[in-house]
């Protein structure tokens, strides 16, 4: 049956273009190293937004780049995407791989639809 990853169906990005959601996976109990990949699906195309590997026992920030930040706690991962614009609206899929030790497991979430609404520009004031 494979491992499943659970994530919310819908998230609304903030006015600053930031969206966060939790990705939770079914733990096999002995995974020490877990790789999390954020994928964006547009039509039939799937593109990688960001990815990182973390050590389960560390329970700390494992991902911090210009696009994503991530913190882990056990079998839950809190993912934040920043810099989103209206064009970034789409389905964001959480992929979790239990990398070490064997056995290898992979779980794909059903995706989180992130809605991004660009703020209206402020009218010029005289």
């Amino acid at each position: 049956k494979g491992m499943h990853a659970a994530q919310p169906a819908v998230v609304l990005a903030s006015s600053r273009g930031v969206a966060s959601f939790v990705c939770e996976y079914g733990s096999s109990g002995n995974a020490a190293e877990v790789r999390v990949t954020m994928l964006r699906q547009a039509g039939s195309q799937m593109t990688e937004v960001c990815a990182a590997t973390y050590t389960v026992e560390d329970e700390l920030a494992f991902l911090d780049d210009s696009t994503c930040t991530g913190t882990s706690s056990g079998n839950k991962v809190n993912l934040t995407i920043q810099g989103l614009r209206a064009m970034g609206t789409g389905l964001y899929i959480c992929k979790v791989e239990l990398m070490y030790p064997p056995p290898y497991y992979v779980g794909m979430g059903n995706g989180t639809q992130i809605y991004v609404i660009d703020p209206e520009p402020c009218p010029d004031s005289d």
Partner: antibody, heavy 114, light 108 residues
Amino acid sequence: EVQLVETGGDLVKPGGSLRLSCVASGFTFSDYPMNWVRQAPEKGLQLVGGINSGGSATYYTDAVKGRFTISRDNAKNTVYLQMNSLRAEDTAMYYCATSNFQYWGQGTLVTVSS
Amino acid sequence: QAVLNQPASVSAALGQRVTISCNTNIGSPYDVQWYQQLPGKSPKTIIYGNSNRPSGVPVRFSGSKSGSTATLTIAGIQAEDEADYYCQSYDDNVDGYVFGSGTQLTVL
């Protein structure tokens, strides 16, 4: 472009030693535990063993336990396979691969013969 | 010890659909991966986690797993699909990864 390049394969006599290297590029090597897999001539694939991303933990198949050692140097993006007490049955193409087998090298040939 | 059993060879005409089975003698709960090995080349992952296809792998390749049998399906065989195909999973008895014996696919 992701690349794994194995080197060090050679013809060696039974009882001899050899060290294989696998240099990675095009991905964050330190994020990936690594495996070594071998394939005897005209035969199937067999796992040799693996190492975690930090290099602190390893595992081996029974056929090589006590003879082979896997290590890595993340600063050099390299994983190693030290092979001692080599036997004729160790003759194979040796591949390195990421622990999820997503990426594979092109292999290096080890021949053990007197 | 669990063994992943595959047919030694299968053949199919160009454009046909072919399936390759991978049977384990235990009802393994573990994920199955499939690899394609073209003549003289290193293996390439074509299916991971039973049914997931890496980017770049043609959509004609698909995988499934039910009970103790995993299946690789190639819908609409192309000449370039002629290769050896290996399944791989995890075996508690050896506490490690095991590979099937491989299936040679011939395109007629």
